[in-house]
């Protein structure tokens, strides 16, 4: 058992049929010695008397807010939450597995550049009686500071019969060094409490592995005289790290016909322009990726050929 | 070349070769189904590799002030990885495929380190740790980890040379 916050305790339970559970001793926070009674949640049923109450916590019915009273006056409370371990694995019932980039991905994180700023998000189908806390650091044995802002509801989607809620949080490394080669990963820890269930989720990554640039900006076409060719030009996204001579991007230019079945022409270039053949009803798209490290490609920026 | 007098390297040549190194490092070990090698308790193996750290002067400002600190750090790393790629971690079982890019990668690491330091002038190099895994599966895991670490190292080196070629070339 350990304290999550003042008067709120997490009981770690091996969860299997007929498990013995955990013995928990609650102590009433009072100088009083006599006439103390204990109740659970809104019930008035007396569970025991005396300054301490010993309970065997086996299931969710044993968790909740225990209150000690004397003569109708509330003396103190303790809230017990359960953290389930099944077959040696902590439960992950509250958040949804996003399955990207691999199974058991509950937290996903992305960075638009090397500034040490990143965003993480998670999904749940639970709407009410749900709270989170978020912590982050660089490294775990001698952690360096990362400051996270508020975790807010960033999207609501309907998935079949279910509503899905997306929460996201922005974090910033306190002493970021964009040009350095990371040797210690960023750790992100999210704990979730739903009703009386406690769970925690972690993600560990290097910023370089979660880089996803914004799409190129100011995508423009310039027809070349007496030719079906056009010169496509674009610029680095505003959010990308500077100087661009150091933090360079590479680009993929794609000509795509109206029909998805049509063959796509693709050109890769380190420049911010390219010459391509513009087919009727086609569109030209450009996306960006770090030039020297194969992290994610940006989303496409597109313009119609006409 | 970064000769003893501390003059500039051939930035453009270094840029081309370091960019080639990036390509080779990724073709030697593409993202294998996003295999997360940090889960495999790699502290004792890849924490010993030289990293380009914040105080090494490899940022744009540091390069402008005095590129020698950074170039020395890069040189150290190149020699370190060149030795690792030539060690029994990569030469032992399981054998690399004949067309593996590791051979080219090894040669390019050597090539870039020589561009940075001609014969007759010696920068201090870092001792390579005695990593001799006994099991082929351990060797395979170690290869993956070394290549992942090398990808990060050569990315920083390539940025340094690209910036140098664009802003510091005579």
């Amino acid at each position: 058992i350990w304290e999550l916050k003042k008067d709120v305790y997490v009981v770690e339970l091996d969860w299997y049929p007929d498990a013995p559970g955990e013995m928990v001793v609650l102590t009433c926070d009072t100088p009083e010695e006599d006439g103390i009674t204990w109740t659970l949640d809104q019930s008035s049923e007396v569970l025991g008397s005396g300054k301490t109450l010993t309970i065997q916590v086996k299931e969710f019915g044993d968790a909740g807010q225990y209150t000690c009273h004397k003569g109708g006056e509330v003396l103190s409370h303790s809230l017990l939450l359960l953290h389930k371990k099944e077959d040696g694995i902590w439960s992950t019932d509250i958040l949804k597995d996003q399955k990207e980039p691999k199974n058991k991905t509950f937290l996903r994180c992305e960075a638009k550049n090397y500034s040490g700023r990143f965003t993480c998000w998670w999904l749940t189908t639970i709407s009410t009686d749900l709270t989170f806390s978020v912590k982050s650091s660089r490294g775990s044995s001698d952690p360096q500071g990362v400051t996270c802002g508020a975790a807010t509801l960033s999207a609501e989607r309907v998935r079949g019969d279910n509503k899905e809620y997306e929460y996201s949080v922005e974090c910033q490394e306190d002493s970021a060094c964009p040009a350095a080669e990371e040797s210690l990963p960023i750790e992100v820890m999210v704990d979730a409490v739903h009703k009386l269930k406690y769970e925690n989720y972690t993600s560990s990554f290097f910023i370089r592995d979660i880089i996803k640039p914004d799409p190129p900006k100011n995508l423009q076409l310039k027809p070349l005289k007496n030719s079906r060719q056009v010169e496509v030009s674009w610029e680095y996204p505003d959010t990308w790290s500077t100087p661009h001579s150091y933090f360079s991007l590479t680009f993929c230019v794609q000509v795509q016909g109206k029909s998805k079945r049509e063959k796509k022409d693709r050109v890769f270039t380190d420049k911010t322009s390219a010459t391509v053949i513009c087919r009727k009803n086609a569109s030209i798209s450009v996306r960006a990726q770090d030039r020297y490290y194969s992290s994610s490609w940006s989303e496409w920026a597109s313009v119609p050929c006409s | 070349r970064a000769v003893p007098g501390g003059s500039s390297p051939a930035w453009t040549q270094c840029q081309q070769l370091s960019q080639k190194l990036c390509t080779l490092a990724w073709s030697a070990h593409p993202l294998v189904g996003h295999m997360d090698l940090r889960e495999e308790g790699d502290e004792e193996t890849t924490n010993d590799v030289p990293h380009i750290q914040c105080g090494d002067g490899c940022d744009p400002q540091g390069l402008r002030d005095n590129s020698q600190f950074c170039l020395q750090r890069i040189h150290q790393g190149l020699i370190f990885y060149e030795k690792l790629l030539g060690s029994d971690i990569f030469t032992g079982e399981p054998s690399l495929l004949p067309d593996s890019p590791v051979g080219q990668l090894h040669a390019s690491l050597l090539g870039l380190s020589q561009l940075l330091q001609p014969e007759g002038h010696h920068w201090e190099t870092q001792q390579i740790p005695s990593l001799s895994p006994s099991q082929p599966w351990q060797r395979l895991l170690l290869r993956f980890k070394i290549l992942r670490s090398l990808q990060a190292f050569v990315a920083v080196a390539a940025r340094v040379f690209a910036h140098g070629a664009a802003t510091l070339s005579p």
């Epitope: 709270t131 989170f132 806390s133 802002g149 975790a151 807010t152 509801l153 809620y165 409490v193 | -």
Partner: nanobody
Framework: EVQLVESGGGLVQAGGSLRLSCAAS????????MGWFRQASGKKREFVAS????????SYADSVKGRFTISRDNAKNTVYLQMNSLKPEDTAVYYC?????FGSGSYYDLMYDYWGQGTQVTVSS
């Protein structure tokens, strides 16, 4: 120093309405859920309603569902409780609470970190 100040309580006849306000100062509660609890004399403090930061997710105790509405104005750092069709059993001291955690809130008062002094609501029959 964080302060939550409730207002709007008073004496009302059964079937009447009241609107409670809770003004927060000392910090913004971005991302943090807020809630209302009440305590009738001689009873335990009980959950009434909670609301997430966006105002999109609300939750109510069964005893007040359909009669009470919780809302918030983040620009004013204020949360409201509109109470309609009041009954004598709604008589209690009403407390505003804010959590330092994120999400939609909790039914348990110990999951909240900041509390107001309370405002008395008395419903006469």
């Amino acid at each position: 120093e964080v302060q939550l100040v409730e207002s709007g309580g008073g004496l009302v006849q059964a079937g009447g309405s009241l609107r409670l306000s809770c003004a927060a100062s000392g910090r913004t509660f971005e991302g943090n859920p807020m809630g209302w609890f009440r305590q009738a004399s001689g009873k335990k403090r009980e959950f009434v309603a909670s609301i997430d930061w966006s105002g999109g997710i609300t939750s109510y105790a069964d005893s007040v569902k359909g009669r009470f509405t919780i809302s918030r104005d983040n620009a004013k750092n204020t949360v409201y409780l509109q109470m309609n069709s009041l009954k004598p059993e709604d008589t209690a001291v009403y407390y505003c609470a804010a959590s330092a955690r994120f999400g939609s809130g909790s039914y348990y008062d110990l999951m909240y970190d900041y509390w107001g002094q309370g405002t008395q609501v008395t419903v006469s029959s």
